[in-house]
């Protein structure tokens, strides 16, 4: 029978609570990590004048962070899902590091980097689900990260600083191109 | 155990206003994002927005501008004002709650019609 106006509805609703699909969960598990990755921009905002800084270019030596790129097929123009997918995949692998040197870099919002690390984990499953040619996925390699680890951490505090701002600023991007690209899926 | 409990529907007329509130227990609801979702008869089910745990939003683009999603941490409870209602905007509203670790729960569903 039909609800009457204004109550609540539980046998008619029921059949329709289905759960997320692939494609709506791996979706707001971005967004989950975009929100989280604001509320870290802010902390370091507020602490450090990274945000306004022209110096980037100066510790951008020292990263190798994972950028989009045409060859990828994650752009509008070229785009090719399974290439991209694994692109998608690959890169967020390689952010894991980068993740993980955020871990002691946050003073009021811990529990927030964590999270963001955790979520990121998770997505990287979902999307490992997702994916045909896993084959194709290259994992980093544990020695050089952790030699890449320790190398972030000895750097000095101004460097340190820097490498955190530069880390939210391009993981967001990414997570933004990823977002974007897997919404054509 | 999980409940979601929506309130606030009901019948109105175009152009008209409703808020629509869902209370939640048994999820550390800080953390977790909050949406509403909503399902017309013979329709797919779409999202219509949803807030993140630091307040980031999104609104489908049929209700934006009309719709304001909110929450309020201390009382666990997740809001939708619906505002210049149309009758397009008929449906079963449901509240959904997403936690980091992919885990989401829905709500029974509230009828809201817009009719004159």
């Known amino acids: 029978a039909p609800v009457p106006p204004g109550e609540d509805s539980k046998d008619v609703a029921a059949p329709h609570r289905q759960p997320l699909t692939s494609s709506e969960r791996i979706d707001k598990q971005i967004r989950y990590i975009l929100d989280g990755i604001s509320a870290l921009r802010k902390e370091t905002c507020n602490k450090s004048n990274m945000c306004e800084s022209s110096k980037e270019a100066l510790a951008e030596n020292n990263l190798n962070l994972p950028k989009m790129a045409e060859k990828d097929g994650c752009f509008q123009s070229g785009f090719n899902e399974e290439t991209c997918l694994v692109k998608i995949i690959t890169g967020l692998l390689e952010f894991e590091v980068y993740l993980e040197y955020l871990q002691n870099r946050f003073e009021s919002s811990e529990e927030q980097a964590r999270a963001v690390q955790m979520s990121t984990k998770v997505l990287i499953q979902f999307l490992q689900k997702k994916a045909k040619n896993l084959d194709a996925i290259t994992t980093p390699d544990p020695t050089t990260n952790a030699s890449l680890l320790t190398k972030l951490q000895a750097q000095n505090q101004w460097l340190q600083d820097m490498t955190t701002h530069l880390i939210l600023r391009s993981f967001k991007e990414f997570l933004q191109s990823s977002l974007r690209a897997l919404r054509q899926m | 155990e999980v409940q979601l409990v929506e309130s606030g529907g009901g019948v109105v007329q175009p152009g008209g206003s409703l808020r629509l509130s869902c209370a939640a227990s048994?999820?550390?609801?800080?953390?977790?994002?909050m949406g509403w979702y909503r399902q017309a008869p013979g329709k797919q089910r779409e999202l219509v927005a949803d807030?993140?745990?630091?307040?980031?939003?999104e609104y489908a683009d049929s209700v934006k501008g009309r719709f304001t999603i909110s929450r309020d941490n201390a009382k666990n409870t997740v809001y939708l004002q619906m505002n210049s209602l149309r009758p397009e905007d008929t449906a079963l509203y449901y509240c959904?709650?997403?936690?980091?670790?992919?885990?989401?729960?829905w709500g029974q569903g509230t009828l809201v019609t817009v009719s004159s």
């Open positions: 959904h709650s997403y936690d980091p670790r992919g885990d989401d729960y």
């Open positions: 807030i993140f745990p630091f307040g980031s939003t």
């Open positions: 048994g999820i550390i609801f800080s953390i977790n994002a």
